[in-house]
């Protein structure tokens, strides 16, 4: 069984301000078990954008039905994009751990660029 990989197929995405950004991510395996999280930026200061396990993320919707037991598509949509949303977004797979889940694999990242609305 090949080790799980996290695939972010788009190196960059350009979205007009006020529109919706789609950030694509798939996993190549269902195992090991553990949640997916999306972050903007890398390192200790990264910003949590979406957590499969818990939390309220009103601007974020998932592309696929994450309650499907065989789901491997963790793509998200972020609504009402503003220039402040620009940055590199990482899809990160965690494996279950006790007491805390452990980061397992990260996608290569997708750079979101925002085109300002014409004045």
């Amino acid at each position: 069984e090949e080790e799980l990989q996290v695939i972010q197929p788009d190196k960059s995405v350009l979205v007009a301000a006020g529109e919706t950004a789609t950030l694509r991510c798939t996993a190549t395996s269902l195992i090991p078990v553990g949640p997916i999280q999306w972050f903007r930026g890398a390192g200790p200061g990264r910003e949590l954008i979406y957590n499969q396990k818990e939390g309220h993320f009103p601007r974020v919707t998932t592309v696929s039905d994450l309650t499907k037991r065989n789901n491997m598509d963790f793509s998200i949509r972020i609504g009402n994009i503003t220039p402040a949303d620009a940055g590199t977004y990482y899809c990160v797979k965690f494996r279950k751990g006790s007491p805390d889940d452990v980061e397992f694999k990260s996608g290569a990242g997708t750079e979101l660029s925002v085109r300002a609305k014409p004045s």
């Epitope: 269902l30 195992i31 090991p32 078990v33 949640p35 499969q52 396990k53 818990e54 039905d65 994450l66 309650t67 499907k68 037991r69 065989n70 494996r95 279950k96 006790s98 007491p99």
Partner: antibody, heavy 117, light 108 residues
Framework: EVQLVESGGGVVQPGGSLRLSCAAS????????MSWVRQAPGKGLEWVAG???????YYGDSVKGRFTISRDNSKNTLYLQMNSLTAEDTAVYYC???????????WGQGTLVTVSS | SYELTQPPSVSVSPGQTARITCSGG??????YAWYQQKPGQAPVLVIY???KRPSGIPERFSGSSSGTTVTLTISGVQAEDEADYYC???????????FGGGTKLTVL
């Protein structure tokens, strides 16, 4: 407050059919996966079937081909259609809400199904 | 037959520590939970994701995992903890939810 209320249980003859319902309230039903779990008298718990928010379905081996799980998100209701019933299907049937990782965080009080001639 | 294995009974005196084990699932593809069931009542989730405690469940209930075995620990057992305890899992490799046969906890 999360509430799950099962109905539709009763006595049915072997080979007969029954449809169970589970009315859900207190949470966004359409966003949650749901399952049916049963418990034969004096026995342990047995998972019967599960359904995703988008109606993908999953079944335990003992009911595959005989039972059908479904949902109506507009009515906040979960269903279990049970066909070709046998005495081994006699049990209390619980509906349960699934967590993000398919464990069960809330359970109804159950409805008793008795298969007897 | 049950895919997860747990002892049929455990007895403990009030104030002591009760431990109930459950084994059978591969660590990398399993999540475990523990359910408490009192006579005539529906099961109640007391531990999920191997070791997490839902809000409203007393701190004396804890869960741990080691390899393919998970353990429910009840510290300072009280008379009200007398119940059947079921280990339940989610098996990502088969998309199923196996249960153990249940453990009857008796408070002496």
């Amino acid at each position: 407050e999360v509430q799950l209320v099962e109905s539709g249980g009763g006595v049915v003859q072997p080979g007969g059919s029954l449809r169970l319902s589970c009315a859900a309230s207190g949470f966004t039903f359409s966003s949650n996966a749901m399952s049916w779990v049963r418990q034969a008298p004096g026995k342990g718990l047995e998972w019967v079937a599960g359904i995703s928010s988008g109606s993908d379905t999953y079944y335990g081996d003992s009911v595959k081909g005989r039972f059908t799980i479904s949902r109506d998100n507009s009515k906040n209701t979960l269903y279990l259609q049970m066909n070709s019933l046998t005495a081994e299907d006699t049990a209390v049937y619980y509906c349960a809400r699934e967590t993000w990782n398919h464990l069960f965080d809330y359970w109804g009080q159950g409805t008793l199904v008795t298969v007897s001639s | 037959s049950y895919e997860l294995t747990q002892p049929p009974s455990v007895s403990v005196s009030p104030g002591q520590t009760a431990r109930i084990t459950c084994s059978g699932g591969a660590y990398s593809s399993y999540y475990y939970a523990w359910y408490q069931q009192k006579p005539g009542q529906a099961p109640v989730l007391v531990i999920y994701s191997d070791s997490k405690r839902p809000s409203g469940i007393p701190e004396r209930f804890s869960g741990s995992s080691s390899g393919t075995t998970v353990t429910l620990t009840i510290s300072g057992v009280q008379a009200e903890d007398e119940a059947d305890y079921y280990c339940g899992g989610y098996d990502q490799s088969s998309y199923t939810n196996p249960f153990g046969g249940g453990t009857k906890l008796t408070v002496l």
